[in-house]
Interface confidence: medium
């Protein structure tokens, strides 16, 4: 079996995050593990062994700095990107040489670096009028990278949850069951990440006379 590439952590990194590319090869079979980068334009083949011509022509490319670790069975060559940038995107090749035949084996891994995007909000949070005893259902979907966290406020204070005020799906959906007069007010959905916050607001007007609230 030839060398293998794994990503640590095993997900697409976002700009300014750290990512490591690990190349693991059986140390009794392979030697001379080396990392190369094949420029920003991706190859037609993104995963698996590269054709021999590409493997031969790697000598014209820069070798990348990497750290070698060994255990009882494998050599592991780790290339770490401490502060990933969009320029780090591309195809990374690990070369390993067969100890006996000296044949080169190459594996490639495409690295995509996600752009940092400030939070934005979509959803159906808008001013509305509801009668006492009815339900209100609104959603607030946030996008951005890193993924923002959603928080809800009423009249600029953290929303008080109970069996009638229910937040679900990572706070994306707010349901107000059995609406009461005190539910009237300004509702804010706020999505925040390290890149800042976005918010949308709506005023809920509650109509009707308060009944015997706690009865069915």
């Amino acid at each position: 079996r030839g060398p293998e590439i794994t990503l640590q952590p095993d997900m697409q990194p976002t700009e300014q995050e750290s990512v490591s590319l690990w190349c693991t090869a059986d140390r009794s079979t392979f030697e001379n593990l080396t990392w190369y980068k094949l420029g920003p334009q991706p190859l037609p083949i993104h995963v698996g062994e590269l054709p021999t011509p590409v493997c031969k022509n790697l000598d014209t490319l820069w070798k990348l700095n990497a750290t070698m670790f060994s255990n009882s069975t494998n050599d592991i060559l780790i290339m770490e990107l401490k502060n990933a940038s969009l320029q780090d995107q591309g195809d990374y090749v690990c070369l390993a040489q067969d100890r006996k035949t000296k044949k080169r084996h190459c594996v490639v891994r495409q690295l995509t670096v996600l752009e940092r995007v400030a939070p934005t909000i979509t959803g159906n949070l808008e001013n509305q009028t509801t009668s006492i005893g009815e339900s209100i259902e609104v959603s607030c979907t946030a996008s951005g990278n890193p993924p923002p966290q959603i928080m809800w406020f009423k009249d600029n204070e953290t929303l008080v949850e109970d069996s009638g005020i229910v937040l679900k799906d990572g706070n994306r959906n707010l349901t107000i069951r059995r609406v009461r007069k005190e539910d009237e007010g300004l509702y804010t959905c706020q999505a925040c990440s390290v890149l800042g916050c976005a918010k949308v607001e709506a005023f809920f007007i509650i109509e009707g006379a308060q009944e015997k609230t706690n009865l069915e």
């Epitope: 009423k154 009249d155 204070e157 953290t158 008080v160 949850e161 109970d162 069996s163 009638g164 005020i165 229910v166 679900k168 069951r177 059995r178 009461r180 005190e182 007010g185 609230t213 706690n214 069915e216």
Partner: antibody
């Protein structure tokens, strides 16, 4: 009539587990949370946690994490609380209660759990 | 956690007089003009019974001699005039944030 009917008293060996039930009737149970409250003999009330009948989402008092497990069976409109590895500290009356909007307007009669060898 | 401290732990009130029970929260339980404090009555061998919700709203079916007041951190339950059947233990409870907590209780005796 809105009612919460709890299971009968239980004598439990230390380390065994106890499961208490609470059957809701007379209201649209899926739009309410069901709460569990503990009361040791001669003591006050302690909130254990709550479960949403609609989707089984639970919120537990940190003190009862690993001790109490809350579940529901929508088909029978019944909420359950399981107490794991009970000790004498778990000997108490356990109430289920309906949360109307942050307060408990309907309570079960209580289930006495006695932990004894 | 928000700690609710009730005082006194017990009190004895003559029939027809006023009973006042206090509940102090370790931080405010009020927001948006509403106070998330509730009061219960419990008699021996029975479950608690809701008396007052949101600090001052009388629960349906509860006699008008019970009243609640307060905001922020200080709340009061008043019973006037006290009747024989009011002998019980009274608890406050907040729902401002999780975990919800109860006060330690106040035992009311009728003289």
């Amino acid at each position: 009539e809105v009612q919460l009917q709890q299971s009968g008293p239980q004598l439990v060996r230390p380390g065994a587990s106890a499961k208490i039930s609470c059957k809701a009737s007379g209201y649209a149970f899926t739009t309410y949370w069901m709460h569990w409250v503990k009361q040791r003999p001669g003591q006050g009330l302690e909130w254990i946690g709550m479960i949403d009948f609609s989707d089984s989402e639970t919120k537990l008092n940190q003190r009862f994490k690993g001790k109490a497990t809350l579940t529901v069976d929508k088909s029978s409109s019944t909420a359950y609380m399981q107490l794991s590895s009970p000790t004498s500290e778990d000997s108490a009356v356990y109430y289920c209660a309906r949360d109307v909007r942050g307060n408990f307007d309907v309570w079960g009669a209580g289930t006495t759990v006695t932990v004894s060898s | 956690d928000i700690v609710l401290t009730q005082s006194p732990a017990s009190l004895a009130v003559s029939l027809g007089q006023r009973a006042t029970i206090s509940c102090r929260a370790s931080k405010s339980v009020s927001t948006s003009g509403y106070s998330y404090m509730h009061w219960y009555q419990q008699k021996p061998g029975q479950p608690p019974k809701l008396l007052i919700y949101l600090a001052s709203n009388l629960e349906s079916g509860v006699p008008a001699r019970f009243s609640g007041s307060g905001s922020g951190t200080d709340f009061t339950l008043n019973i006037h005039p006290v009747e024989e059947e009011d002998a019980a233990t009274y608890y406050c409870q907040h729902s401002r944030e999780l975990p919800w907590t109860f006060g330690g209780g106040t035992k009311l005796e009728i003289k």
